[in-house]
């Protein structure tokens, strides 16, 4: 996705993005909370594609691992947190049934706040 | 994805999420920047599935439409911005070729900062 740094901006939370194949992912959590096996190949007409996912998570090596950038520390505690979204993937469930299911993948790193009670 | 509010937390940026059908989406931008038509249905072994996408964007009606929550305003200007990610979708390109391509969809609302130059 577009890079804020190119516009002279900073992100409140530092993130890293990478492409992950199903072969590396192996399993995922579906919408009902069950663990499913992510299939390596997606059939296309008389062939197959590798199943890939674009994943974004908070950068564990980044400046913001201790808290979000730019926060008013007098009033707030902050934390960068990886959030998830749903994408459709070809999967196999525990009963060996193959089908397209929505699975959770990491898609963003956002800042969450808690108010400072005692000052 | 998990709701920070449930843990007594606030998001720096307010977002809204919704399921969007290909019929509503109609077109999208692929990884090479070209516009493709998103097909309404995906063929599966026993019929067809409606093509759906889980999209998250900044809430235009939210408190944070004027800037991010909890920012140190003495030092920073802030803005909540919708970011995008890639998901594979069955699409048709300008040459009428049907295939699975990665398209951009809205997946998050993050806060970007610019430093205040003059105080």
């Amino acid at each position: 996705h577009s890079d804020p740094a190119r516009r002279g901006e900073l992100s409140v939370c530092d993130s890293i993005s990478e492409w992950v194949t199903a072969a590396d992912k192996k399993t995922a959590v579906d919408m009902s909370g069950g663990t499913v096996t992510v299939l390596e190949k997606v059939p296309v007409s008389k062939g197959q594609l590798k199943q890939y996912f674009y994943e974004t998570k908070c950068n564990p090596m980044g400046y913001t691992k201790e808290g979000c950038r730019g926060i008013d520390k007098r009033h707030w505690n902050s934390q960068c947190r990886t959030t998830q979204s749903y994408v459709r993937a070809l999967t196999m469930d525990s009963k060996k049934r193959i089908g397209w299911r929505f699975i959770r993948i990491d898609t963003s790193c956002v800042c969450t706040l808690t108010i400072k009670r005692g000052r | 994805h998990s709701d920070p509010a449930r843990r007594g937390e606030l998001s720096v940026c307010d977002s809204i999420s919704e399921w969007v059908t290909a019929a509503d989406k109609k077109t999208a931008v692929d990884m090479s920047g070209g516009t493709v038509t998103v097909l309404e249905k995906v063929p599966v072994s026993k019929g067809q599935l409606k093509q759906y996408f889980y999209e998250t964007k900044c809430n235009p009606m939210g408190y944070t439409k004027e800037g991010c929550r909890g920012i140190d305003k003495r030092h920073w200007n802030s803005q909540c911005r919708t970011t995008q990610s890639y998901v594979r979708a069955l699409t048709m390109d300008s040459k009428k070729r049907i295939g699975w391509r990665f398209i951009r969809i809205d997946t998050s609302c993050v806060c970007t900062l610019t430093i205040k130059r003059g105080r």
Partner: antibody, heavy 118, light 108 residues
């Protein structure tokens, strides 16, 4: 700039072993599957082996299965090909190549020559 | 395994002429075909992917077409730097990923 630099080629006798390395730079190494493609002298291109970004998916051509082992060290941004029980027909330039999401090859190294001769 | 057959084996042409290279697949591969150029002593270079999309930095004189089993690479007006060997590769059905035998475009 994307760079792929192979090393480890040389002259060996049939039945011997060799380990090729490929140092990658200029891109997020873990995001890309990597492959080895070879070219015998005066011949065409032959795909040898491929490995997914984190090493969970590994694939070989039938001609090398059981003899060659592909691996990667993501902490060093390096791809390897361990070649055992080498044969005369393995003589070739071995190219390290980066794979795109759709499994074609967008960047190639300059290659390293492996000669198997008695 | 999908077999790719390239023809002709050698194409002898003069600079400025049009070159038409063919790649035939043993079974349908949708549009999942790439073309590479290789000059003597150099590594191959990606020219075309998805049968007709030019890779970054590739001049407009290179044009790919076709789908299914029949594919064509056309070089509209040969420049001196275009004399090389051209390979096609399919990525519809894998492993293995397979290449054609190559077409050599030489100066007449």
């Amino acid at each position: 700039d994307v760079q792929l630099v192979e090393s480890g080629g040389g002259v060996v006798r049939p039945g011997e072993s060799l380990r090729l390395s490929c140092a990658a730079s200029g891109f997020t190494f873990t995001s890309y599957a990597m492959n080895w493609v070879r070219q015998a002298p005066g011949e065409g291109l032959e795909w040898v082996s491929g490995i997914s970004g984190r090493g969970g998916g590994i694939y070989y051509a039938d001609s090398v299965k059981g003899r060659f082992t592909i691996s990667r060290d993501n902490s060093k941004n390096t791809l390897y090909l361990q070649m055992n029980s080498l044969r005369a027909e393995d003589t070739a330039i071995y190219y390290c190549v980066r794979e795109t999401l759709n499994i074609f090859f967008d960047y190639w190294g300059l290659g390293t020559l492996v000669t198997v001769s008695s | 395994e999908i077999v790719l057959t390239q023809s002709p084996g050698t194409l002898s042409l003069s600079p400025g002429e049009r070159a038409t290279l063919s790649c035939r697949a043993s079974q349908a591969i949708n549009y999942y075909l790439a073309w590479y150029q290789q000059k003597p002593g150099q590594a191959p270079r990606l020219l075309i992917y998805d049968a007709s999309t030019r890779a970054a930095g590739i001049p407009a004189r290179f044009r790919g077409s076709g789908s299914g089993t029949e594919f064509t690479l056309t070089i509209s007006s040969l420049q001196s730097e275009d004399f090389a060997v051209y390979y096609c590769q399919q990525y519809n059905n894998w492993p293995p990923l397979t290449f054609g035998g190559g077409t050599k475009v030489e100066i007449k």
